[in-house]
Amino acid sequence: ESGYAQNGDLEDAELDDYSFSCYSQLEVNGSQHSLTCAFEDPDVNITNLEFEICGALVEVKCLNFRKLQEIYFIETKKFLLIGKSNICVKVGEKSLTCKKIDLTTIVKPEAPFDLSVVYREGANDFVVTFNTSHLQKKYVKVLMHDVAYRQEKDENKWTHVNLSSTKLTLLQRKLQPAAMYEIKVRSIPDHYFKGFWSEWSPSYYFRTPEINNSSGEMDPI
C-alpha cells in the first residue's frame, strides 16, 4: 500500500525536501519547556533523519531531539529564551538544512479547558467561562482567546469573539431560540511572546431556551 497511484507521485512544488516547522511550549511540565518539530512534506523518508538544536541554551552547546513516531521532541529546562537557536536536520554528522529560530516567537499555548456556559434568566444572557493553565505561568501569562460558537446544524458558520479575559457574555437575543449550540475556545500569545494558536478546547454543547420560557441554568448535553 506504499506509494501513490499510477497516475503520478504527489508533486507539490512549494514543499522543499526537508522543510520543517516547530513550536515551543514554555513551562509545559513544571519548569520544563518543550520543543516539537516535524517535516512539512508528508512524503519525506524520515528513517535516518535526526534534529538537533544548538545555541541559546544553558550549560550545553547542543541538544538532540527524541523521535516520537513522525515528530521530533525535546523536553528540557535548558532553553535560555534569549536570542536565536539553530535547529538542524541531520543525517549522521551532516546537516541537511538549518533554521535560526527564537523560541519565544514560536510559542503554542496549551489548550484552554473547563469551558462552560450558564444561562442567566433574569439577565437574558449566557455567561461563558473557561480556564487556562497559563494564569499560573511565569512566562506566557498574557493570551488572546478566540471563542467560536455555532448553531449545531450550521456546519461551517462559526461566530468568533476575541477576548483577553476568560469570561464572555453572550446576549440571548443574538442567538436562535430553542436551538442547540456548540462552543469552543483556543488561545494565542499576546504580549512579548509570539507564536501559534493552541489546539481547540473540548467543545461544550448548550441549548437556548424557548422564547418566554423560564428554564433557569443551561444544562450541558
Partner: nanobody, 117 residues
C-alpha cells in the same frame, strides 16, 4: 488498539461535493503523518492525499489535485477530506490511515463514495 472510523460518503452527482471524516483512536494521532486512500471495484487501493503531523504540509495524487483538500484536527483526532467537483472516476471506498503503514496496521470499514447521475 488502533481504530479508524470513516464517515461522510454517499451518492452524489458529477460536479458535486462531499466531506469525509475519519475518527482515529488507539495511537498518538498528532505524531503521525495521515493519509486518505481509496479502492475502486476491481482495482488496487491507491493513495489519494497525505498531511503532515502539524497539518502544514500536504500532498495529492495528480488525479485529485485542485479538487480535494485534506485537513486535520489534532485536538479531536480527526482527519478530513473535502472533495469538490467530483467525477465518476472518484467512485470508490475511501479509507483513512497512517501514511507510513506498519505490518500490524488495520483498516477501518471505509466509506463508500458513488459519483453518478
Amino acid at each position: 488498539q488502533v481504530q479508524l472510523v470513516e464517515s461522510g460518503g454517499g451518492l452524489v452527482q458529477p460536479g458535486g461535493s462531499l466531506r469525509l471524516s475519519c475518527a482515529a483512536s488507539g495511537f498518538t494521532f498528532s505524531q503521525r503523518i495521515m493519509s486518505w486512500y481509496r479502492q475502486a471495484p476491481g482495482k488496487e487501493r491507491e493513495l489519494v492525499a497525505s498531511i503532515s503531523p502539524f497539518g502544514d504540509g500536504t500532498r495529492y495524487a495528480d488525479s485529485v489535485k485542485g479538487r480535494f483538500t485534506i485537513s486535520r484536527d489534532n485536538a479531536r483526532n480527526q482527519l478530513y477530506l473535502q472533495m469538490n467537483t467530483l467525477k465518476p472516476e472518484d467512485t470508490a471506498v475511501y479509507y483513512c490511515n497512517k501514511r507510513n503503514l506498519e505490518i500490524s496496521d488495520d483498516w477501518g470499514q471505509g466509506t463508500q463514495v458513488t459519483v453518478s447521475s
